[in-house]
Interface confidence: low
């Protein structure tokens, strides 16, 4: 790397991936292994984030950008930049202070994270329930009863795979 020549701030010419090394007459030195500088003019390089244990490496650290982590199976990311991993539950459950709990009747969760949400109220939109909701799936709303012409065969929704509501503990 060339010695910088700016009279005002010799460090300003040091590009990303380097740091301005005061110990070596302000020469732009490359970031050491496992460190990076994402902007120019840095006087130090930042230590790369290590994705260990519950964290899994999504993007390796480079001399100009930090590593990015996600979560190992059984966990999901929380917070900016996946600063935390929270334990998963199953679909049809939500994480509470007493562990993973089944969604109450009338609610569902189609993900391994987050909370149980109420089924859609089809009648609010003037529609009817086409497919019943379960703990894992929202109801499917169909056309309003008025939309069904007289004598038209009504669709019989399939029975849910299992009865929605709490399973015995």
């Amino acid at each position: 790397f060339e010695r910088t020549r700016s009279l005002q701030d010799p460090c300003s010419n040091c590009p990303a991936g380097t740091f301005c090394d005061n110990n070596r007459n302000q020469i732009c030195s490359p970031c050491p292994p496992n460190s990076f500088s994402s902007a120019g003019g840095q006087r130090t390089c930042d230590i790369c984030r290590q994705c260990k244990g519950v964290f899994r490496t999504r993007k390796e650290c480079s001399s100009t950008s930090n590593a990015e982590c996600d979560c190992t199976p059984g966990f999901h990311c929380l917070g900016a930049g996946c600063s935390m991993c929270e334990q998963d539950c199953k679909q049809g459950q939500e994480l509470t202070k007493k562990g993973c709990k089944d969604c109450c009747f009338g609610t569902f969760n189609d993900q391994k994270r987050g909370i149980c949400r109420p089924w859609t109220n089809c009648s609010l939109d003037g529609k009817s329930v086409l497919v019943n909701g379960t703990k894992e799936r929202d109801v499917v709303c169909g056309p309003s009863p008025a939309d069904l012409s007289p004598g038209a065969s009504s669709v019989t929704p399939p029975a849910p795979a299992r009865e929605p509501g709490h399973s015995p503990q």
């Epitope: 260990k52 244990g53 935390m84 334990q87 459950q93 007493k98 562990g99 993973c100 709990k101």
Partner: antibody, heavy 113, light 110 residues
Framework: SVEESGGRLVKPDESLTLTCTAS????????MTWVRQAPGKGLEYIGF?????DTSYASWSKGRFTISKASTTVDLKISSLTTEDTATYFC???????????WGPGTLVTVSS | AQVLTQTPSPVSAAVGGTVTINCQSS????????LSWYQQKPGQPPKRLIY???DLASGVPSRFKGSGSGTQFTLTISDLECDDAATYYC??????????FGGGTEVEFK
């Protein structure tokens, strides 16, 4: 409730499987952990298994200890036993977020030649 | 490796008094608050008292109070009763998914 079983007197280098039986709750709702306590010593975390069956171990227990589960039981397999493994082994219910809220009475493993 | 250091041990107490048990972590626990406290009596399994540093577990008397964040945590037991004689453990969760118990603090009565 949870209850451990399978503890007994074993010889060094043998293997042993301990079983934790869960009743009154579903293992699909709770994470389960194994912890041990040598005579007169403190509690020592071994590892856990989560609702999806994923496992995690303390750095010292990786390799020799294996946690698995069935519908109502959680097993801890210990291989290549040494006298240092002599301890009471506890099974606990809960999770990392909120701690372990329900424990069994423990099962004693004695390793001696 | 992460270490949780508990002080003092043992601690001598008087019925009706207050004891404070400190738990210092060699590095910040997960989310600065993933720390639990357990009570254990001889021949019994641990009993969860506190989780998330300060939340009281169900069925635990409000005489037990947890506080702290990051690397410094405290369990305070007030209005001590004879039944509180036990060993108390802190336990922390760390970002690498490690779960660590402290060495334990024995509470005994004068």
């Amino acid at each position: 409730s949870v209850e451990e079983s399978g503890g007994r007197l074993v010889k060094p280098d043998e293997s042993l499987t301990l079983t934790c039986t869960a009743s009154g709750f579903s293992l699909s709702h709770y994470w389960m952990t194994w912890v041990r306590q040598a005579p007169g010593k403190g509690l020592e975390y071994i590892g856990f298994i989560n609702v999806g069956g994923d496992t995690s171990y303390a750095s010292w227990s990786k390799g020799r200890f294996t946690i698995s589960k069935a519908s109502t039981t959680v097993d801890l397999k210990i291989s290549s036993l040494t006298t240092e493994d002599t301890a009471t082994y506890f099974c606990g219910r809960g999770g990392l977020t909120f701690g372990w809220d329900l424990w069994g009475p423990g099962t004693l493993v004695t390793v001696s030649s | 490796a992460q270490v949780l250091t508990q002080t003092p041990s043992p601690v001598s107490a008087a019925v009706g008094g207050t004891v404070t048990i400190n738990c210092q972590s060699s590095q910040s626990v997960y989310s600065n608050s993933f720390l639990s406290w357990y009570q254990q009596k001889p021949g019994q399994p641990p009993k969860r008292l506190i989780y998330s540093a300060s939340d009281l577990a169900s069925g635990v008397p409000s005489r037990f109070k947890g506080s702290g964040s990051g690397t410094q945590f405290t369990l305070t037991i007030s209005d001590l009763e004879c039944d509180d004689a036990a060993t108390y453990y802190c336990a922390g969760v760390y970002s690498d998914n490690t779960y660590v118990f402290g060495g334990g603090t024995e509470v005994e009565f004068k």
